[in-house]
């Protein structure tokens, strides 16, 4: 099997004159191809992966949320010849009429790294953005975390920045099908020049309290009481986009080999996340689980 | 498959409101962009607004500062509200969803909006 080979980081790494064919090992026979896009309120940008696959031929197709940062993500896999260069690179979702809304800033400046490099996102050298709320949504904390896409054996990352809808968040995230997009919000103007090491605690866990040992008297003493947060509290998010199906066919899972030397693959469903607010609120962050390993 | 289901229109005197709404069902795991469109006979359909995920509005110019659109994912709605209404506002107005690549969109089936005297 010959299948087109590439790796797009926020460039035109997947542009037709930078593809290139790859021969298959034996006993692959599937091509694959998996786009994922992040969008934040002062931009867009997209990886791609394109090369040989594993699992069976199939489409998926996945809309995720993470406090106001949106992925998407799209994932084919074609068991013909250079079949693997179908899927739109961007978005092409935006109508061209009309003018976008002018949105007031709302006082908190953030730094914002959409489609830059590691070396560019570092610190305090992003350029600085300043935060909007746009509609009922409320931008007035700062993010700094990584998207990342694995797909034919290959696994490309870049770091994002920007303004959220939440101020508290810890190491939070959405998986998709060989997609994860993860990080920390902080509060207060450009907050966000390195999270990687923030901590779980914040202004809305009460800290533990150490009661004074109760007076000696003749009747048996109380017990003494403490109080403790048993799991971080996670701020309830209001709004969720809701982000429809780009198939007309049934989404299914498409099963991604990971990088050797990366993390266990994830596939065909919100593998790492669970949506501890708005539930029943659609969509779930992450969308809905997808069976595992079927074709389409 | 998606489902998408307008009310609200209807026969309004100008400088009145109507309010427009859309209900969503389905799959709708991947939607990014909802939009509003309105057609009259013999013209192509226009869009009048769209809202992203994220909160993010567009509007054409003729609405502009009279039309607001909205959505709330709780009840998987829509909504166009519709103030100062002018003779030239009236068409069949369509609801329109599509996923964030353009590779996907639905379309409703069309509420009628009269605006006259």
């Known amino acids: 099997l010959e299948c087109y080979s590439c790796v797009q980081k926020a460039d035109d790494g997947c542009s037709p004159n930078k593809m290139k064919t790859v021969k298959c090992a034996p006993g692959v026979d599937v091509c694959t191809e998996a786009v994922g896009a992040v969008e934040t309120i002062h931009g867009q940008f997209s990886l791609a992966v394109r090369g040989c696959g594993s699992g069976l031929p199939g489409k998926n197709d996945r809309g995720l949320d993470l406090h106001g940062l949106l992925a998407f993500i799209q994932l084919q896999q074609c068991a013909q010849d250079r079949c693997n260069a179908k899927l739109n690179l961007t978005s092409r979702a935006l109508d061209p009429a009309g003018n976008e809304s002018a949105y007031p800033p709302n006082g908190v400046e953030c730094y914002s790294c959409v489609g830059l490099s590691r070396e560019a996102c570092q610190g305090t050298s992003p350029p600085v953005v300043s935060c909007y709320n746009a509609s009922d949504h409320v931008y007035k904390g700062c993010f700094d975390g990584n998207v990342t896409l694995t797909a034919a054996n290959v696994t490309v990352s870049l770091p994002v920045r920007g303004c959220v809808q939440d101020e508290f968040c810890t190491r939070d995230g959405v998986t998709g099908p060989g997609f994860t997009l993860s990080g920390s919000c902080c509060q207060g103007s450009r907050c966000n020049s390195d999270l990687r090491n923030k901590t779980y605690f914040s202004p809305r866990i009460p800290p533990l309290v150490r009661l004074p040992p109760p007076e000696p008297t003749t009747v048996a003493s109380t017990t003494s009481v403490t109080t403790s947060t048993s799991a971080p509290v996670r701020p309830t998010s209001t709004t969720k986009p809701m982000p429809a199906p780009t198939s007309q066919t049934p989404r299914q899972g498409v099963e991604h080999e990971a990088s050797r030397d990366e993390e266990p693959r994830l596939t065909g469903g919100a593998a790492g996340h669970q949506d501890r607010s708005n539930s029943g609120q659609y969509p779930a962050k992450g969308g809905p689980q997808q069976p595992h390993n079927k074709g389409c | 498959q998606v489902q998408l289901l307008e009310s609200g229109g209807g026969k309004v005197q100008p400088g009145g409101s109507l309010r427009l709404s859309c209900v969503v069902s389905?799959?709708?795991?991947?939607?990014?962009?909802m939009g509003w469109y309105r057609q009259t006979p013999g013209k192509q359909r226009e869009l009048v607004a769209h809202?992203?995920?994220?909160?993010?509005?567009n509007y054409a110019d003729s609405v502009k500062g009279r039309f607001t659109i909205s959505r709330d994912n709780s009840k998987n709605t829509l909504y166009l509200q519709m103030n100062s209404l002018r003779a030239e506002d009236t068409a069949v107005y369509y609801c329109?969803?599509?996923?964030?690549?353009?590779?996907?969109?639905?379309w409703g089936q069309g509420t009628l909006v009269t605006v006259s005297s």
């Open positions: 329109n969803v599509r996923n964030f690549w353009g590779s996907a969109e639905y």
């Open positions: 809202i992203r995920g994220n909160g993010r509005t």
């Open positions: 389905g799959d709708t795991s991947s939607i990014y962009l």
